[in-house]
């Protein structure tokens, strides 16, 4: 179920997955929520005396049991990922942090009159992930009212330092507030030759596009279908970027599909989950568990309810079926995507819906007639 | 068009712009409306980009710079390239486009008449070539549709000018001995029309030339009269296929 409480002065021991810098515990929790494997986190709001570089450290953790031993640590805040908290799921982070310098690669500096204007500049710049604004009281006159647009390979600051009269924050692209525009085009038979930032295995170009949308540095992608000539690249989704923010003219390539990240979209922004169940397909990965259920939909539901499950394969092979149903293999991987996709007539595969938002509809399913 | 002048809106209502929408959108070729759902153009326009879904077809347009993402366009339902067209040769440079949805005819967007098979030997005297192509060999696409009047050149004479090529009877040539007026890059697939017995006819499809508007190097066009059977057969067989797939 959904565990949203935070534990003050508590640090989870072990289970370390990754460490990043975040300005507060709420942002750390968000980062954990959208990390493919993170279930628990610990955030250091206060630095240990000798380890000043650990302050603002966000330690993402996993656990087979879903819990880790807690130790007392002053200034530490710990909690759970919100992976199963449908209505609370949002990548949007609007908070502004006064007195903090969120450091990263400064790629643009310009004068602006307000923090809001600076945040808007960041939101409307394709490369900007976070920003720092120097107020009119900043100690160096030449930097006063300067807006620094920043980025990093992880999408989060490379370090965070307290500095008076600096204000930092994040791009609001994830809040669907960008005015850049949103190219929905999908180019069949075309490939982009630009720089690859990462690659994942996906069953189709639409999943590839969603993965690209939620990757911090992916601006566009090329997906190679199952018919692609190079076996090792079949069903591979290449996440790409470029200095200009635009792809170079696409190259004609049979069995390739290309398109753009939808992270700058206002209305068409996808959810970080994939509803479709792919029949005749098997997703390979680390085995988490296997149960016997009636149908692929039930298998998807089981995967969704199992917090560590990222994707599943449901097998209809005679040897995989019993009276209570057929084999539902719950699986996971380091990046949340299958390690390999194979085509098997008796298989159906899909993804956990743990990161899907629960839509609270105002239109009731059951209508109550007024008296 | 080299040596041409600006056209006015509705002057050549059969002229369409074939554009490719990839990272950016660009005018690639011209074409001619020959029916509510049919465009006639050059096969070579699709070399390397034979994918219907990236093409956008704009009719009733005079100025390309006025096209925005709100401008309505037609999409390709079916692309029919002549079965004998080869990328390594210059013959059979003809293609038919079936549109996803039929066009509404207006005074700015309507079809051009096709010649009859009997017109293969007709002598035309009032012929015009139109397009948004380059106005010089190393030029750029034009915003406003250009037009130029151009005399036809007999095939025997044309063959003498093009000793390294085969000028077949399915080609027709047009140009001035001294050069100066011709179709150019970006005009491909567009119409060479001639007024005959009071009506405009689609005599040629802009195909190729050695450079543009060079002296003694006429433009070479696909001779439409030689392909009437092919055009009618393809349109008919497409209709029959549509009947087969329509609900009972």
């Amino acid at each position: 179920g959904c565990l949203s409480q935070l534990y003050a002065n508590t640090f989870f021991r072990g289970g370390d997955l990754a460490a990043i810098y975040t300005p507060d515990a709420q942002h750390c929790q968000k980062m954990c929520t959208f990390h493919p494997r993170c279930l628990l986190f610990s955030f250091l709001a206060v630095s240990p005396t000798k380890e000043t570089d650990k302050r603002f450290g966000c330690f993402m953790k996993e656990s087979i049991t879903g819990t880790l031993p807690r130790i007392h640590r002053t200034g530490a805040i710990s909690g759970h990922s919100l992976k199963q908290c449908g209505h609370q799921l949002s990548a949007c982070h609007q908070d502004i942090y006064e007195g903090l310098d969120m450091r990263g690669s400064n790629f643009n500096i310009s004068k602006t009159d307000s923090i809001e204007e600076c945040q808007k500049l960041c939101t409307n710049n394709i490369h900007c992930q976070f920003f720092t604004y120097a107020t009119k009281a900043f100690h160096r006159p030449e930097y006063r009212k300067s807006c620094l647009l920043k980025r990093s390979s992880s999408g989060t600051p490379t370090s965070i330092k307290p500095v008076d009269n600096l204000v930092s924050g994040f791009s609001l692209k994830s809040c669907a507030l960008s005015e850049i525009g949103c190219p929905m085009d999908i180019f069949q038979h075309f490939a982009f030759a630009d720089l690859n930032v990462s690659q994942v295995v996906t069953p189709d170009a639409f999943v590839c596009r969603t993965v690209c949308t939620f990757h911090p540095n992916c601006l566009f992608f090329t997906f190679y279908t199952n018919e692609w000539e190079t076996e090792s690249q079949r069903n591979v989704c290449f996440l790409k970027t470029s200095k200009s923010g635009r792809p170079s003219p696409p190259i004609i390539q049979e069995n390739a599909v290309s398109g753009y990240s939808l992270f700058t979209c206002r209305k068409a922004r996808p959810e970080p989950c994939h509803f479709k169940i792919y029949s005749g397909v098997a997703f390979e990965g680390e085995e988490l568990n296997a149960t016997f259920v009636q149908g692929a939909d039930a298998c998807q539901e089981t995967c969704t309810k199992t917090i560590r499950c990222q994707f599943f394969t449901y097998s209809l092979l005679p040897q995989d079926c019993k009276a209570e149903g057929c084999k539902c293999s719950l699986r996971l991987s380091t990046d949340g995507s299958p390690t390999r996709i194979t085509y098997e007539a008796q298989g159906s595969s899909g993804y956990s819906l743990r990161l899907c938002k629960v839509v609270e509809s105002s239109d009731c399913t059951t209508k109550i007639n007024a008296r | 068009i080299v040596g041409g002048t600006n056209s006015s809106l509705g002057e050549w209502p059969w002229q369409v712009s074939l554009q490719v929408k990839l990272v950016s959108q660009n005018h690639m070729c011209g074409g001619s409306i020959i029916g509510r759902q049919w465009i006639l153009t050059a096969a070579h326009c699709f070399d390397g980009i034979p994918y219907p879904d990236v093409w956008r077809i704009y009719g009733g347009i005079l100025n390309l710079s006025e096209i925005t993402n709100k401008t309505p366009f037609s999409s390709i339902k079916e692309l029919i390239i002549h079965q004998k067209y080869k990328m390594s040769e210059g013959s059979y440079d003809i293609a038919l486009i079936k549109l996803q949805t039929p066009l509404n005819y207006t005074e700015f967007q309507k079809p051009i008449c096709l010649p009859s098979k009997a017109d293969t030997n007709t002598i035309y005297t009032n012929c015009w070539v139109t397009g948004w192509g380059y106005t010089k060999e190393r030029g750029e696409t034009q915003n406003i549709l250009q037009k130029a009047t151009i005399p036809l050149v007999p095939n025997e004479e044309c063959q003498k000018k093009y000793r390294d090529y085969v000028i077949t009877k399915q080609m027709i040539c047009a140009g001035y001995k001294e050069g100066g007026i011709d179709a150019c890059k970006g005009d491909s697939g567009g119409p060479l029309v001639c007024k005959h017995s009071g009506r405009w006819q689609l005599v040629g499809i802009t195909s190729w030339g050695e450079g543009c508007a060079r002296k003694e190097q006429p433009g070479v066009y696909t001779k439409v009269a030689e392909y009437i059977d092919w055009i009618l057969e393809k349109i008919q067989s497409s209709k029959e296929r549509a009947l087969e797939t329509s609900p009972a």
């Epitope: - | 050059a42 070399d47 040769e89 210059g90 440079d93 000793r163 090529y165 890059k185 491909s188 190729w208």
Partner: antibody, heavy 125, light 108 residues
Framework: EVQLLESGGGLVQPGGSLRLSCAAS????????MTWVRQAPGKGLEWVSY????????IYADSVKGRFTISRDNSKNTLYLQMNSLRAEDTAVYYC??????????????????WGQGTLVTVSS | EIVLTQSPGTLSLSPGERATLSCRTS???????LAWYQQKPGQAPRLLIY???SRATGIPDRFSGSGSGTDFTLTISRLEPEDFAVYYC?????????FGQGTKVEIK
């Protein structure tokens, strides 16, 4: 399947003559411009001559002009290169090639899409 | 005549690396008339790229051509063992038709 097969190469003394043939199959020979290209031992490629589809137009490299004659017999699907007054520097592998001439952006393209396997001509005393 | 200058003369690379071959022409060449060929020892040349950037039939997409005017480039995105050979650019924009002197791509 397009095929080009050269023959007629061999050893010849300086000042001598040789006639190379290239038998073509798998395409409409009379529609294509044809060319000869040569390659001296250990050296790069050198264009020699071309002939128009009808055979009425020929062009030569300066190094062979007046000594070599290109011709074709469209009824036999054969290309020829008559080489007279041969010199030591004419020693090379001679290739015949088909010149593809498609259309792109209202201009023609030109490239050698099919090549023969080559025939060696050695000019030596 | 139009002189084609290829550089470098020799390129020593390992399989998997990217190869960039340059071809400069002494006069403007219409890109429709520029081609690239590959030749292996004892074999006839093979057409790779025509019209400066169009891949010939059957040529793997790791080969790509670009350029216009007087500067043309052949790129092999990831060298395979079978790509080690001599590469020639050629123009047929003006007679006499001419070839570049070739670039040898050898195993490092």
């Amino acid at each position: 399947e397009v095929q080009l097969l050269e023959s007629g190469g061999g050893l010849v003394q300086p000042g001598g003559s040789l006639r190379l043939s290239c038998a073509a199959s798998g395409f409409t020979f009379s529609h294509y411009l044809m060319t000869w290209v040569r390659q001296a031992p250990g050296k790069g490629l050198e264009w020699v001559s071309y002939i128009s589809p009808s055979g009425g137009h020929t062009i030569y490299a300066d190094s062979v002009k007046g000594r070599f004659t290109i011709s074709r017999d469209n009824s036999k699907n054969t290309l020829y290169l008559q080489m007279n007054s041969l010199r030591a520097e004419d020693t090379a592998v001679y290739y015949c090639a088909r010149v593809a001439r498609g259309i792109a952006a209202r201009s023609r393209t030109s490239y050698f899409d099919y090549w023969g396997q080559g025939t060696l001509v050695t000019v030596s005393s | 005549e139009i002189v084609l200058t290829q550089s470098p003369g020799t390129l020593s690379l390992s399989p998997g690396e990217r190869a960039t071959l340059s071809c400069r022409t002494s006069q403007f060449v219409n890109s429709n008339y520029l081609a690239w060929y590959q030749q292996k020892p004892g074999q006839a040349p093979r057409l790779l790229i025509y019209g400066a950037s169009s891949r010939a039939t059957g040529i793997p997409d790791r080969f790509s051509g670009s350029g216009s005017g007087t500067d043309f480039t052949l790129t092999i995105s990831r060298l395979e063992p079978e790509d080690f050979a001599v590469y020639y650019c050629q123009q047929s924009s003006r007679t006499p038709w001419t070839f570049g002197q070739g670039t040898k791509v050898e195993i490092k």
